[in-house]
């Protein structure tokens, strides 16, 4: 005969937090470690599952195809209910009836998703939205891979993504002193560096590299390098290219300079010679297929030239240099030095020997060029 369960037989309600799509195990333990009758019901008293003889039986609930129990643990008095592929609407109070006791478990299922694609361009905004059961009042705290903490309620917004935001975001949802952790992988589509400067002596080969800060299985898009030479009044397109399945193919290249581009990633360009007329700054843009906006990397070229003309030894640099850079001319193994925070230095009637032209930043040499000054003999006076 069915015994009535009194109020004192009703154990304190437990709260369990679950994640949408995950599996949860709601525990229910009998005092005696033996197989006995048990039932799991929802708040509407609809049977979900239970035991009939030695067999697991399922009721007419919506959970019937996703609910199960660990039969191997029944002999130990453990009558847990496992719910697979959790849905927000699975949030409910579940009752386990065993040994004339009722154990209530409140299950709250949460979901946290990115509103858009998780592959976002640098500077774009990321919004994370929390799905939660009616009546709940959760709080959310997210930590970026770089250690940035952001708090919110039903939505969390990161207005401008930076390249260091790439990686796994860990978000903790709290409700009734319980927590559930979500991990969301965010890929910030950007170049590894926002800007880079190449320092070269006149005539040297120049290499520009544009490594990406992410990897994708299939990478398709198109790009262009615009160049603003210091000596030119306007910028010009140096090269345009396509990127298909990580293979680079050049579409159009300027005739001067004659650039070469690598066909593999990372994007790589070679300029045969560093010349003063090429010194300046460029902007490489990459538009990725199915993404709005473009990736950008700035690249600067600084060119040095040391020349001797008649009695004048000159060292010059062209290109974007900061005012704090020092340009100096010094005679090897001698104290003679001329230094200036300028783009040109010169020595009149230089001593014979090996002169060094140095471009330095706080003592660190960025670029050097050597020039040999040969002794000049006075021209004999014609009789």
């Amino acid at each position: 005969e069915q015994k009535l369960i009194s109020e004192e037989d009703l154990a304190a309600k437990k709260v369990v937090l679950g994640k949408k799509g995950d599996t949860v195990e709601l525990t229910c333990n009998a005092s005696q470690k033996k197989n006995t009758q048990f039932h799991w019901k929802n708040s509407n008293q609809i049977k979900i599952l239970g035991i009939q003889g030695l067999f697991l039986t399922k009721g007419p609930s919506k959970l019937s195809d996703r609910a199960d129990s660990r039969k191997s643990l029944w002999d130990q008095g453990c009558f847990s209910m496992i719910i697979k592929n959790l849905k927000i609407e699975d949030s409910d109070t579940y009752i386990c009836e065993v040994e004339n006791k009722k154990e209530e478990v409140e299950l709250l299922v949460f979901g946290l998703t990115a509103n858009s694609d998780t592959h976002l361009l640098e500077g774009q905004s990321l919004t994370l939205t929390l799905e939660s059961p009616p009546g709940s009042s959760p709080s959310v705290k997210c930590r970026s891979p770089g250690g940035k903490n952001i708090q919110g309620g039903r939505t969390i917004s990161v207005p401008q993504l930076e390249r260091q935001d790439s990686g796994t975001w860990t978000c903790t949802v709290s409700q009734d002193q319980k927590t559930v952790e979500f991990k969301i992988d965010i890929v910030v589509l950007a170049f590894q560096k926002a800007s880079s400067t190449v320092y070269k002596k006149e005539g040297e080969q120049v290499e520009f590299s544009f490594p990406l800060a992410f990897t994708l299985e299939k990478l398709t898009g198109s790009g262009e390098l615009w160049w603003q030479a210091e000596r030119a009044s306007s910028s010009k397109s140096w090269i345009t290219f396509d990127l298909k399945n990580k293979e680079v193919s050049v579409k159009r290249v300027t005739q001067d300079p004659k650039l070469q581009m690598g066909k593999k990633l990372p994007l790589h360009l070679t300029l045969p010679q560093a010349l003063p007329q090429y010194a300046g700054s460029g902007n490489l843009t990459l538009a990725l297929e199915a993404k709005t906006g473009k990736l950008h990397q700035e690249v600067n070229l600084v060119v040095m030239r040391a020349t001797q003309f008649q009695e004048n030894l000159t060292c010059e640099v062209w290109g974007p240099t900061s005012p704090k850079l020092t340009l100096s001319l010094k005679l090897e193994n001698k104290g003679a030095t001329v230094s200036k925070q300028a783009k040109a230095v010169w020595v009149l009637n230089p001593e014979a020997g090996m002169w060094q032209c140095l471009l330095s930043d706080s003592g660190q040499v960025l670029l050097e060029s050597n020039i040999k000054v040969v002794p000049t003999w006075p021209t004999p006076v014609q009789p």
Epitope: E207, K244, S249, V250, K264, H268, T270
Partner: antibody, heavy 118, light 107 residues
Framework: EVQLLESGGGLVQPGGSLRLSCAAS????????MSWVRQAPGKGLEWVST????????YYADSVKGRFTISRDNSKNTLYLQMNSLRAEDTAVYYC???????????WGKGTTVTVSS | AIQMTQSPSSLSASVGDRVTITCRAS??????LGWCQQKPGKAPKFLIY???TLQSGVPSRFSGSGYGTDFTLTISSLQPEDFATYYC?????????FGQGTKVEIK
């Protein structure tokens, strides 16, 4: 085992045409770039042409541009080289090659000989 | 087009010798360089890609190094089956170009 088997070589008169085939097996043909490389008698290796994977970009050596056409039939796992306006200097052993994921020619066929002579 | 210059064009060596072949590119090609081996009457066999990565199945006595314009193929201890012609190949961009080859002969 990855295998490439060339066919279609032979003797042809200057100005004539030939179509070389390369049957591929042992790998997912459509996902790799494929190339043709040739070697004239007693000479070194010369790259002729490359066709990228299923996107189909094609590249040619200046010496064959406008005369040779590379193509592929992914459903038949076959690479082709259509050679028109053949010249004596096109006489060579033609090798079919497969590129690896890093776009290097990692597997080579045994080659097929093309002789252009009157 | 990028020119690839191999040296020497031929060399004589004995079994057990350490052999070094160099390849120079006319411009910087990063590490986009491969090496292959060809025996008389046979198809070339790929040995090394990305300047230093050994193709699977290639004996560890073969090694490659270099970046930019200067590259080296080294055979640490020459074996009888290593007597062949070796070619370097730039894979930086099109047109792909080979070195003229280095013939390794028995001394």
């Amino acid at each position: 085992e990855v295998q490439l088997l060339e066919s279609g070589g032979g003797l042809v008169q200057p100005g004539g045409s030939l179509r070389l085939s390369c049957a591929a097996s042992g790998f997912t043909f459509s996902t790799y770039a494929m190339s043709w490389v040739r070697q004239a008698p007693g000479k070194g290796l010369e790259w002729v042409s490359t066709i990228s994977d299923n996107i189909g970009n094609t590249y040619y050596a200046d010496s064959v541009k406008g005369r040779f056409t590379i193509s592929r039939d992914n459903s038949k796992n076959t690479l082709y080289l259509q050679m028109n306006s053949l010249r004596a200097e096109d006489t060579a052993v033609y090798y079919c090659t497969k590129d690896n994921e890093d776009y290097y020619m990692d597997v080579w066929g045994k080659g097929t000989t093309v002789t252009v002579s009157s | 087009a990028i020119q690839m210059t191999q040296s020497p064009s031929s060399l004589s060596a004995s079994v057990g010798d350490r052999v070094t072949i160099t390849c120079r590119a006319s411009q910087g090609i990063r590490n986009d360089l491969g090496w292959c081996q060809q025996k008389p009457g046979k198809a070339p066999k790929f040995l090394i890609y990305a300047a230093s990565t050994l193709q699977s199945g290639v004996p560890s006595r073969f090694s490659g190094s270099g970046y930019g314009t200067d590259f080296t193929l080294t055979i640490s201890s020459l074996q009888p089956e290593d007597f062949a012609t070796y070619y370097c190949l730039q894979d930086y961009n099109y047109p792909r170009t080979f070195g003229q080859g280095t013939k390794v002969e028995i001394k």
